[in-house]
Interface confidence: low
Amino acid sequence: FYDIETLKVIDEEWQRTQCSPRETCVEVASELGKSTNTFFKPPCVNVFRCGGCCNEESLICMNTSTSYISKQLFEISVPLTSVPELVPVKVANHTGCKCLPTAPRHPYS
Amino acid sequence: FYDIETLKVIDEEWQRTQCSPRETCVEVASELGKSTNTFFKPPCVNVFRCGGCCNEESLICMNTSTSYISKQLFEISVPLTSVPELVPVKVANHTGCKCLPTAPRHPYS
């Protein structure tokens, strides 16, 4: 038999692992698809991205709503001939997540 | 030009993005390499894993120390011939991280 306390602990753990927006470290240059001679300092920013587990293997944790937040970063061109520019960089921030089918059937077929 | 307050905010953001143990959602079955007819409920647990950014592209955030923590989970075999068993599952928990070379030179050569 399972005692109620243990079940409660397991359930709390499960709730915390479920698909939801989680603070994640995102590499700015790859996010923006910038050229290799442009890089950012810091190279990474913290934003919320969908992550966690879904109940079924056929489902994947995906974003259902997104906002864009502005982060102040140094944009640096190599060679370093000009002063690093302090620029506002807009990065996607997931505000809503859902477990959705990985390969959805074509809705229009 | 950069005012000191902005630099402070940028630096705080950078500190938060750096390579460190972060609470992560881990799928137990794939972690333990269990056979496909055994699965766990909940399927995922929260543990700390190394994540975040390194200063250089040639470095990767890797664990330098690990502990193993025990999680109480239901182990379920398919077909369901027996009652789901409440079992302690040991999962790796990263306690220390460091930015290390992706392809380290062989220290013993």
Partner: antibody, heavy 117, light 112 residues
């Protein structure tokens, strides 16, 4: 509050090497995007940018003077050192240390260096 | 190198009257990132230069609104709507779009 102060000899002889030190406070040369540079101004004349050094130890020199200049930093001491070889009377100028931002906001008070035998 | 040409060399002014200084660059100062890094400094007698205007038209903090900057490409102007006695000194334009960063020869503003 950002401050920069230049120090070095007031008088140097022709052909000698000039060594100037910039001691700064209010920021760190280990901070991303930070740089410290040198600008000079001959008496009654225009300003001329000489060199700068970045937080990541990248250096940039005015191409015209490149062969005579060396810039280095000591992050722990908050100091930047500029050396200029083979000094000539035409190098007589006030030498300013600046925090390299775009544009230059913070300047040192300057140090007058006279080149004379 | 980018040559920065300032006119006039000397500008005698009457307090309360407007003044205008021109700065012309030998090449466009529009950076590949779209910004134009043309700045104006004032060097008061016996002092270090101090920033007045950055990126063509932005007044630096604490700079009175009688100072304004304008222009684009290669032609730039600094205007003082009503000159005050404390405005005397040498005004320099400067570009930091291209290396080496260069300065104009200066315009000496003095009271008539």
């Amino acid at each position: 509050q950002v401050t920069l102060k230049e120090s070095g000899p007031a008088l140097v002889k022709p052909t000698q090497t000039l060594t100037l030190t910039c001691t700064f406070s209010g920021f760190s040369l280990s901070d991303y995007g930070m740089g410290v540079g040198w600008i000079r101004q001959p008496p009654g004349k225009a300003l001329e940018w000489l060199a700068n050094i970045w937080w990541n130890d990248d250096k940039y020199y005015n191409p015209v003077l490149r062969s005579r200049l060396t810039i280095s930093k000591d992050t722990s001491k908050n100091q930047v050192v500029l050396t200029m070889t083979n000094m000539d009377p035409v190098d007589t100028a006030t030498y300013y240390c600046v925090q390299v931002t775009n544009p230059f906001v913070f300047w040192g008070e300057g140090t007058l260096v006279t080149v004379s035998s | 190198d980018i040559v920065m040409t300032q006119t006039p060399l000397s500008l005698p002014v009457t307090p309360g009257e407007p003044a205008s200084i021109s700065c012309r660059s030998s090449q466009s100062l529009v950076h590949i990132n779209g910004n134009t890094y043309l700045h104006w400094y004032l060097q008061k007698p016996g002092q270090s230069p101090q920033l007045l205007i950055y990126k063509v038209s932005n007044r630096f903090s604490g700079v009175p609104d009688r100072f304004s900057g304008s222009g684009s490409g290669t032609d730039f102007t600094l205007k003082i709507s009503r000159v005050e006695a404390e405005d005397v000194g040498v005004y320099f334009c400067s570009q930091s779009t291209h290396v080496p960063w260069t300065f104009g020869g200066g315009t000496k503003v003095e009271i008539k």
